[in-house]
């Protein structure tokens, strides 16, 4: 426990102290006091540096004194022979004796008392920044007017913090400016502007004088600006060393002025104002900004319009422009949106044609459509080349966005017909010689394919069966072959309105207008064994002359069989109508004069016994196109005859082209258009 006073006596005092002794005393007086230690008696064996026996006085780590020998008072009025004054409240006294004493020594007697210390003057380090006040057992610090004592109870500073500036313009100065600023102070000023405005600080060099930096370059007094995670400064010295205009890019700024105890100067003065937050003029590729300005600030709105061929894609929606607003944080809204090249996407496929997979489907890319040659050609022109246009469509120079249409090539057999042995009088043929040949199984007859959806035949073939089963693509009509070929399903049968329907068709003598069209449910796929025949043109070039040659084909009656298994064909000439009239009807069902002959009929045959016969009805009489020798057109349809192996009568197709075209147009489907 600390005590105010005390006595310390050497061992056995006042008798002689023993040899080989080491004893220590720890003196402690209350905090705020020093210790006055004085000796009234001292009789210790003398030695150099008190090496043998001694009394040692230690304060902290410092030896205050080491005593030996005999002392007596110099003052007759005072018993004190030696004394020590320490400004600390702790002291240690250590007594040591060696192994022998030549004489008898009585040791020492000492006393200590607590003494007041003057903290304000007794120490090298002044405890108070301004005023120090001593009292018995302690001290306190005090401050001049307008200063306040900090929590450490030692330092004084000015009350210069806590100011918040919210006006868009203002002036801030150090305390007492232009008089010297207070020492030992930390001044914090806050500028808080509305979001969207940045604090801009303006200083003049001459309005700044702050204690200069030390030799290491560290500011002793400093001015610092903090804006979010950005810091400007610290600044110090004579004349402002930083930029005279500080754009903080923030609506919040903290100004911190820190001073130490020495070297006060006049300080500083600054102005600030709020600038609308600028947004950078960003380089957005492939676009135009409207309005165009040198500088954009908070609340400015721009319309960013993509150049032709570019679009902004947000989710699944493509647009050509978007709006962006300069936001309070100095960033543009919608900054993620970009003008990307328009993507026309995978080009649509077309029926009976193809488009190569494009390397790119972006703006400017080029694709080419082709038709499945040689069976289809591009009907609507344009060359099939399309480019990806700015509107996101594949566009052709001629057709625009309309897709090309691949339509069947007509009248071109894959293999030309060559007459072999005479068979009534015909030759074996292959379906590739007559790819337009259609087989009707009930009644056994023929027809001609004229496009993907239509079959041309004789009216008498379909008058008794409005749902005929037809086949294309097979040379043989053996069942196993037909099972492998293409079966055609009718949707509707259109018989020419001029064809007279009879109660008893077997007794017919009038075959005028013997023509019908069958509309198919599904389009026919063309190929080497299935391909349409052309229709005649309406010009006089397509008027047949006597002797003009035509080809007939079918599975009708031959000399050997009632029905042919494999396709037969013959080449025969056009003959005058009278030649057909002159032939006697083989099995007349009426008077010979009753048979009707009209200009709607073509007479052909009579040469080498080549003729069509029962079962060939409806098949085409195919003639070489006068304007394109590579093609055949259906000049006639096998209709009737007086006698197989002589002359036969064929419906003159040229007379019905208008009816055919009208019927097809009126009964087409959207798919076909």
């Amino acid at each position: 426990e600390p005590t105010m006073y005390g006595e310390i006596l050497s061992p056995n005092y006042p008798q002689a102290y023993p040899s080989e002794v080491e004893k220590s005393w720890d003196i402690e007086v209350p905090e705020g006091y020093g210790i006055h230690l004085y000796f009234t008696h001292l009789d210790i064996e003398l030695s150099e540096n008190c090496a043998y026996d001694s009394v040692q006085i230690i304060s902290g780590d410092t030896e205050e004194g080491r005593l030996c020998g005999q002392r007596s008072s110099n003052n007759p009025h005072s018993p004190i022979v030696e004394e020590f004054q320490v400004p600390y409240n702790k002291l240690q006294v250590i007594f040591k004796s060696d192994f022998s004493n030549e004489e008898r020594f009585t040791g020492f007697a000492a006393y200590y008392v607590a003494t007041d210390i003057n903290e304000c003057t007794d120490f090298v380090d002044v405890p108070c920044s301004h005023f120090c006040n001593n009292f018995i057992g302690g001290y306190f610090c005090s401050c001049p007017p307008e200063y306040f004592l900090h929590d450490d109870m030692k330092n004084c500073g000015v009350n210069c913090s806590g100011d918040v500036f919210t006006a868009l313009i203002g002036e801030i100065a150090s305390p007492n400016y232009p008089k010297p600023y207070p020492e030992n102070s930390r001044c914090e000023y806050q500028i808080r502007l509305e979001k969207g405005f940045q604090v801009v600080v303006t200083l003049r060099r001459e309005d700044f004088d702050v204690e200069a930096a030390d030799s290491a370059g560290n500011c002793l007094d400093s001015l610092v600006f903090v804006a979010g995670d950005r810091q400007f400064g610290p600044y110090c010295g004579h004349g402002f060393p930083g930029p005279l205009n500080i754009e903080t890019k923030s609506n919040a700024l903290d100004i911190i002025f820190q001073t130490d105890l020495t070297g006060q100067k006049k300080g500083w003065k600054l102005r600030y104002h709020g600038d609308p937050m600028p947004c950078p003029k960003e380089d957005t590729p492939n676009s135009v900004w409207e309005p165009a300005k040198a500088k954009y600030v908070f609340r400015d709105v721009v319309q960013i319009t993509c150049l032709d061929g570019f679009e902004v894609v947000e989710g699944r929606v493509g647009a050509t422009s978007f709006y962006s607003t300069c936001q309070s944080n100095g960033k543009w809204s919608n900054s993620k949106l970009k003008c990307q090249p328009v993507d026309c996407g995978i080009p649509e496929s077309i029926e009976n044609g193809k488009v190569e997979d494009p390397e790119s489907t972006l703006f400017g890319s080029v694709i080419r459509y082709t038709c499945e040659e040689p069976y289809y050609y591009m009907e609507n022109g344009g060359g099939g080349e399309y480019h990806c246009a700015g509107n996101g469509s594949w566009v052709n120079e001629v057709l625009g966005p309309e897709l090309p249409k691949c339509v069947p090539v007509c009248g071109v057999p894959r293999e030309p017909f060559e007459e072999k042995q005479r068979i009534i009088g015909g030759s074996d043929a292959d379906i590739k010689n007559f790819p337009w040949q259609v087989f009707f199984d009930n009644p056994w007859a023929g027809g001609a394919l004229i496009n993907e959806y239509w079959v041309l035949t004789a009216a008498h073939v379909v008058e008794g069966n409005r749902e005929p089963t037809m086949y294309v693509g097979s040379t043989s009509v053996q069942t196993s072959r037909l099972a492998k070929s293409k079966m055609l399903t009718p949707e509707h049968v259109f018989i020419h309105p001029g064809w007279k329907l009879l109660e008893v068709p077997e007794g017919r003598t009038n075959f005028d207008n013997d023509i019908a069209l069958v509309r198919l449910k599904d389009p026919v796929k063309m190929g080497p064994t299935v391909s349409p025949i052309c229709l005649p043109g309406t010009s006089s070039d397509y008027n047949l002359m006597d002797g003009d040659l035509g080809l007939i084909s079918g599975w009708g009656r031959t000399e050997k069989r009632d029905r042919a298994v494999r396709l037969k064909a013959a080449r025969l000439p056009v003959a005058p109508l009278r030649k057909c009239k002159e032939v006697k009807v083989e099995k007349p069902t009426a008077d010979a004069e009753a048979y009707v002959f009209t200009p709607n009929m073509i007479c052909a045959g009579g040469e080498k016994g080549m003729d069509s016969c029962k079962g060939d009805s409806g098949g085409a009489f195919a003639v070489q196109d006068p304007n394109d020798k590579t093609k055949f057109y259906a000049a006639g349809l096998v209709s009737w005859g007086p006698q197989c192996g002589t002359y036969g009568l064929y419906t003159r197709v040229k007379n019905y082209v208008d009816w055919i075209m009208k019927t097809m147009q009126e009964n087409s489907t959207p798919r076909e258009d």
């Epitope: 043989s476 009509v477 053996q478 069942t479 029905r563």
Partner: antibody, heavy 119, light 107 residues
């Protein structure tokens, strides 16, 4: 009118071969496609194969592949079916049949030839 | 090869009965199906071809229906001459196959 006349009944030992003929009258073999069908006693009909004149190849049922040979002699309008490595289960009536036209499977059947395989 | 499954294998019926025999193909055969009637010791006789077409000379009491994989032969009113074995046959592929047969016997 097409008619098919088949060769007479045969009795064969297991392991032997049999050749059944089928003569066409009223038409030429070149215009026809001949099929062969057999029927074991009390059992169902079993298609064996055919010559396809369009492709010029003979098609056999998997079951008979390697054991059956179908040939034609167009000069005599006769079709032949030879079955080798006979076993008792080959005992059956063997029919030649002409393929039909325009969706009819078979037109004319021969009268059948009974082949008996017995040791 | 295409398998043909006929049912029932045996059918007992009386004169005047309506009889139905079904045939199922293991894959689609479109309408390429025929029905035959066979009497003991005779070659089969074609009744129906292309699933529903009646062969000429065959009584109209016989009818066929179906397409794809399911087919039916119907005898609207069974006659004494109709007791026989009936076979279905597919000819969609060159490798023709028959059903195992349905024997129609007197009840």
């Amino acid at each position: 009118e097409v008619q098919l006349v088949q060769s007479g009944a045969e009795v064969k030992k297991p392991g032997a071969s049999v050749k059944v003929s089928c003569k066409v009258s009223g038409d030429t073999l070149t215009e026809l496609s001949m099929h062969w069908v057999r029927q074991a006693p009390g059992k169902g009909l079993e298609w064996m194969g055919t010559f396809d004149p369009e492709e010029g190849e003979t098609i056999y049922a998997q079951k008979f592949q390697g054991r059956v040979t179908m040939t034609e002699d167009t000069s005599t309008d006769t079709a032949y079916m030879e079955l080798s490595s006979l076993r008792s289960e080959d005992t059956a009536v063997y029919y030649c049949v002409t393929e039909g036209l325009a969706g009819r499977p078979y037109d004319v059947w021969g009268q059948g030839t009974l082949v008996t395989v017995s040791s | 090869d295409i398998q043909m499954t006929q049912s029932p294998s045996t059918l007992s019926a009386s004169v005047g009965d309506r009889v139905t025999i079904t045939c199922r193909a293991s894959q689609s055969i479109s309408s390429w199906l025929a029905w035959y009637q066979q009497k003991p010791g005779k070659a089969p006789k074609l009744l129906i071809y292309k699933a529903s077409s009646l062969e000429s000379g065959v009584p109209s009491r016989f009818s066929g229906s179906g397409s794809g994989t399911e087919f039916t032969l119907t005898i609207s009113s069974l006659q004494p001459d109709d007791f026989a074995t009936y076979y279905c046959q597919q000819y969609n592929s060159y490798k023709l196959t028959f059903g195992q047969g349905t024997k129609v016997e007197i009840k």
